[in-house]
Interface confidence: low
């Protein structure tokens, strides 16, 4: 069963539970999740994930029991985990994935839980002991039984059968808003220094919410929506409203790159790189975020917020949600996908527009023309063969269609005349007493990537022309330069003469005119998605990937592109990760995408990088990435003590020890070193990879990465008996690059 971050199931419990045999199998990527609550006025059993660890709380009368899984085993890894909790004959046992994790004696009293069982969340239950519990589950319960009875039946409409695809969707999978009340909630969008929200939007909705973030002060918010087919952004602060419109239409079913940028001075919305921004009036100031960032829809509170607002957003508009999809979502530069959402409603993994599906049905039989190679146009299905009425002139004997169609060939980005040979009559017009000016063409469906331009007064608006116009070269096709190698026009052809002829010619026949696009090689060019300045800490290395620079080439795949680093190769700071010390003067686009390259700073002023990229035929103009090396600044973020029993071991986690640096978008190596002797124990590090069972060995140096991975611990080895608590003072120094912070 799939739970989406705001749903739950309830199961009645009529009598007290004397024995408990609870079995759950769940998977989630969220570190917080309420799995199950058996609730009474005071007695209760709670199973939840907190910081990725399973916690069990059992309260029986005046007694409270807590069990939890070890810190080093995180269960929020999207993998199914099986939990078994048994309470039998005064003994509670918890095991996860077949391993015994904890057990303890419990009072023999039965568990009085008349409020019932709550699976996946607590609903509207408001009991004092629920304060501070985890968020509702966003993930899957593959199985849940209590004393042999399934807790997942019956399912409610909000809890779906099976395990939804969206929980395992990587962040390159689009967020599909399938309506009518779609919504995705993400962690709050902080805009303290500046905030950016970026995504690619595809929709035909002319009116729909896109993003809403409430502020800490009552009434403050940031709201981005589609209003009359265009993007609009509203920022409401205590000192007034900032309203911004963008002129690029977005409700056309085509993908549009959207970027919203806000800082203390201005607000900017950009669609397909066309920006609109407020003047630097400085009215915005900082909006302290409250609650979640809502995308594609609004919850009841946000709707209320907007309805109270003087913009006069109507209830209908605020209740509606986006119908369409968001791809490549990033919030403050961090990629976000369905997996990171805190809750979702009526969402789909991937982009499937209902309009598109409808179109596919309606034009299914045309589809072959747009996908087959141009030399192999199939026998025309269109027009439908015409059966002439009896008694017509002999010229119409065996007549089925008026025209023989041949593909129009155009260069990518070029123009081509529509000529007689493309729309050649199958019969002798003079013999049929028809004039070319009486054969009327009307464009019923335009090409996807170009325009038929008519050099005839008034014809462009009517999209109509005659065979005489074709002969006189009055109709030409102008291609828009896109990369598809085929396209098509749908033409309706009718005859306006008052002579005897088949009635189908008066009514009109529909023809498909295939368009074959001959590609032109576009030179690639280099783009810097986050600007052409890169900051690196002195004496460190920084990955060079597509987030730093990338190639744009509309007609070459990444496989066909090669980068060159220009300038002298000696001392070149670009290297492959697996060939350290070897300058990489040339590398492939694939290597760049795979994260194989690093910039290594070895001292002195940082060397700027000038690149060019080639598709094998043409090279881009050189592009320079300016690189600035800054001295590392190290700041202690956390340095708390540990309390542990003599003779035991305790992990040192980021909550106990972590530092922050001034690295910008750089995952730097932070080295801790022990500078003084330990009296009562030793610092230990787990073997590489932190694999289960890897040995712990004494160390006097470790990296912050080791701390983050739970691979550092303090082991008390002092065998002596003390009448007091002993205190080990761990003297550390921290090194980043060649910068050292001592006496930590």
């Amino acid at each position: 069963a799939s739970f989406f971050g705001e749903n739950h199931l309830e199961v009645p419990v009529a009598t007290a539970l004397t024995d408990i045999d609870l079995q759950l199998q769940f998977s989630t990527s969220q570190p917080e999740a309420l799995l199950l609550l058996a609730a009474g006025p005071a007695d209760h059993l709670l199973l939840q994930l907190y910081s990725g660890r399973l916690q069990v709380r059992l309260v029986l009368g005046q007694e409270e029991l807590r069990l939890q899984t070890p810190a080093e085993t995180l269960l929020s890894d999207s993998i199914p985990h099986t939990v078994v909790l048994t309470v039998v004959e005064g003994w509670a046992t918890l095991s996860v994935d077949g391993f015994l994790n904890a057990s303890s004696a419990v009072p023999g009293a039965p568990l009085e839980v008349p409020y019932g069982l709550f699976v996946g969340g607590t609903g509207t239950l408001g009991l004092p002991y629920l304060r501070g519990t985890s968020r509702p589950l966003r993930g899957c319960l593959h199985a849940a039984t209590l004393n042999g009875r399934s807790l997942l039946r019956p399912l409610t409409p909000d809890v779906h059968e099976g395990c939804a695809e969206e929980f395992s969707a990587s962040d390159d999978v689009a967020l599909g808003f399938s309506g009518p009340h779609s919504l995705a909630a993400f962690p709050a969008w902080g805009t303290q220094d500046e905030g950016t929200l970026e995504f690619t939007l595809t929709t035909q909705s002319r009116q729909a919410p896109l993003a809403f973030q409430a502020g800490g002060r009552r009434g403050d918010f940031i709201y981005v929506d589609i209003f009359e087919g265009h993007l609009r952004a509203v920022v409401e602060k205590g000192q007034g409203t900032v309203l911004l419109h963008n002129s690029v239409p977005v409700a056309d079913g085509q993908p549009h790159e959207v970027s919203v940028h806000i800082n203390a001075h201005r607000l900017e919305i950009s669609v397909d790189q066309y920006p609109t921004h407020t003047s630097n009036r400085g009215v915005l100031s900082y909006l302290e975020p409250r609650g979640s960032l809502l995308l594609g829809g609004l919850d009841a509170e946000a709707s209320r917020h907007l309805q109270e607002h003087r913009l006069g957003l109507t209830p209908e508009a605020t209740n509606a949600s986006l119908l369409g999809c968001m791809e490549d979502l990033s919030v403050n530069g961090q990629r976000r996908g369905l997996r990171e959402a805190l809750l979702t409603r009526n969402m789909a993994a991937g982009c499937r527009l209902e309009e598109e599906e409808y179109e596919d049905d309606a034009y299914g039989h045309y589809e072959a023309f747009s996908t087959l190679a141009p030399e192999a146009w199939p026998a025309m299905e269109l027009p439908e063969p015409c059966v002439p009425e009896p008694g017509l002139p002999p010229v119409f004997a065996n007549f089925t269609q008026l025209l023989t169609i041949s593909p129009l060939v155009v260069a990518e980005g070029g123009t081509a005349w529509l000529e007689w040979r493309h729309v050649q009559p199958t019969l002798d017009l003079m013999e049929a007493e028809l004039r070319k000016s009486q054969v009327l063409f009307s464009v019923t469906r335009g090409a996807r990537h170009g325009e038929l331009e008519l050099d005839i007064p008034g014809a462009q608006a009517r999209k109509m022309f005659t065979l005489l116009d074709v002969v006189n070269r009055k109709a030409r096709f102008i291609h828009d330069g896109s990369e598809d190698t085929s396209d098509q026009l749908v033409l309706e052809v009718s005859v306006t003469a008052r002579v005897p002829m088949p009635s189908c010619l008066r009514r009109g026949q529909t023809y498909l005119l295939p368009i074959q696009v001959n590609p032109v090689n576009d030179p690639p060019h280099i783009i810097f998605p986050h600007g052409s300045l890169m900051v690196i800490l002195e004496h460190t290395q920084k990955p060079l990937g597509p987030e730093v620079f990338q190639a744009y080439d509309p007609d070459s795949a990444c496989e066909g592109l090669t980068f060159q680093v220009l300038g002298t190769s000696s001392g070149l700071p670009v290297e492959r990760r697996d060939q350290p010390g070897e300058p990489a003067t040339e590398f492939s686009c694939r290597e760049l995408e795979a994260g194989s390259l690093v910039y290594v700073h070895r001292g002195g002023p940082a060397q700027d990088l000038t690149f060019r990229v080639s598709d094998g035929l043409q090279a881009s103009p050189p592009a320079t990435l300016k690189v600035v090396a800054i001295r590392p600044a190290i700041q202690i973020h956390r340095s708390t003590g540990l309390r542990l029993a003599q003779g035991s071991a305790m992990p040192i986690l980021p909550a106990n020890l972590s530092v922050e640096t001034n690295a910008v978008g750089q995952d730097v190596s932070v080295l801790f070193r022990v500078t003084g002797a330990l009296q009562f124990g030793e610092l230990q590090k787990q073997g590489a990879g932190g694999v289960e069972g890897a040995e712990w060995w004494a160390t006097q140096a470790f990296h912050q990465r080791d701390v983050e991975q739970g691979r550092v611990r303090y082991l008390s080895t002092d065998p002596q008996h003390h009448a007091y608590d002993t205190v080990e003072n761990l003297a550390l120094e921290v090194q980043v690059g060649q910068e050292i912070l001592s006496n930590l």
């Epitope: 002797a677 124990g681 590489a688 040995e695 006097q700």
Partner: antibody, heavy 122, light 107 residues
Framework: EVQLVQSGGGLVQPGGSLKLSCAVS????????MNWVRQAPGKGLEWVGE??????????YYAESVKGRFTISRDDSKNTAYLQMNSLKTEDTAVYYC?????????????WGQGTLVTVSS | DIQLTQSPSFLSASVGDRVTITCKAS??????VAWYQQKPGKAPKPLLF???YRYTGVPSRFSGSGSGTDFTLTISSLQPEDFATYFC?????????FGGGTKVEIK
């Protein structure tokens, strides 16, 4: 100035015993883990073993090739580390270095003795 | 045990050359690698630790990189005093092990 001064090397017959000493000055000996590393003539370096601090219960680790035959000990009052070598084999012929790590951490050796040659030959 | 394979075993170079020595571990050792320089008849001297951190007093022409299984020691511009044998060492797990060494000779 940190100094590790070694003594006790020499010629010994196979099956014999020898005790090497390493006297330390210039740092607080009792805070440093002491190690022994050896180098056969014209060959590479081989770690022999280590001894930790009193707070680590003087924990010892050894290379498989010497386990059961060699014993590392320390006397913090004399600032000296020892390598007791028993049941010596011809392949134990090497220059033996005592090394330490403490201040500049990681299990790599920041201070080295001058080395002492042990020759096992009949 | 973790084996460390150094290459090349011998290297002829001239003063001013850029020299690269590689060290390959038989399994993942993270960045727990140190490099030493040894001259004939002398004890080894530490150069780098944690794959890329220079030991106090080591000239900046010595640099190191790598993580996992592949490591490199680079001397950006060889000086007369750099002709020596270089060893890598892993301290990711016991037993601690060394590479076979790379002798840098004058061309």
């Amino acid at each position: 100035e940190v100094q590790l001064v070694q003594s006790g090397g020499g010629l010994v017959q196979p099956g014999g015993s020898l005790k090497l000493s390493c006297a330390v000055s210039g740092f607080t000996f009792s805070n440093y883990w002491m190690n022994w590393v050896r180098q056969a003539p014209g060959k590479g370096l081989e770690w022999v073993g280590e001894i930790r601090l009193k707070s680590n219960n003087f924990g010892r680790y050894y290379a498989e090739s010497v386990k059961g035959r060699f014993t590392i000990s320390r006397d913090d009052s004399k600032n000296t580390a020892y390598l007791q070598m028993n049941s010596l084999k011809t392949e134990d012929t090497a220059v033996y270095y005592c090394t330490s790590y403490g201040n500049y951490v990681g299990h790599y050796f920041d201070h080295w003795g001058q080395g002492t040659l042990v020759t096992v030959s009949s | 045990d973790i084996q460390l394979t150094q290459s090349p075993s011998f290297l002829s170079a001239s003063v001013g050359d850029r020299v690269t020595i590689t060290c390959k571990a038989s399994q993942n050792v993270d960045t727990n690698v140190a490099w030493y320089q040894q001259k004939p008849g002398k004890a080894p001297k530490p150069l780098l630790f944690s794959a890329s951190y220079r030991y106090t007093g080591v000239p900046s022409r010595f640099s190191g990189s790598g993580s996992g299984t592949d490591f490199t020691l680079t001397i950006s511009s060889l000086q007369p005093e750099d002709f020596a044998t270089y060893f890598c060492q892993q301290y990711n797990s016991y037993p601690l092990t060394f590479g076979g060494g790379t002798k840098v000779e004058i061309k």
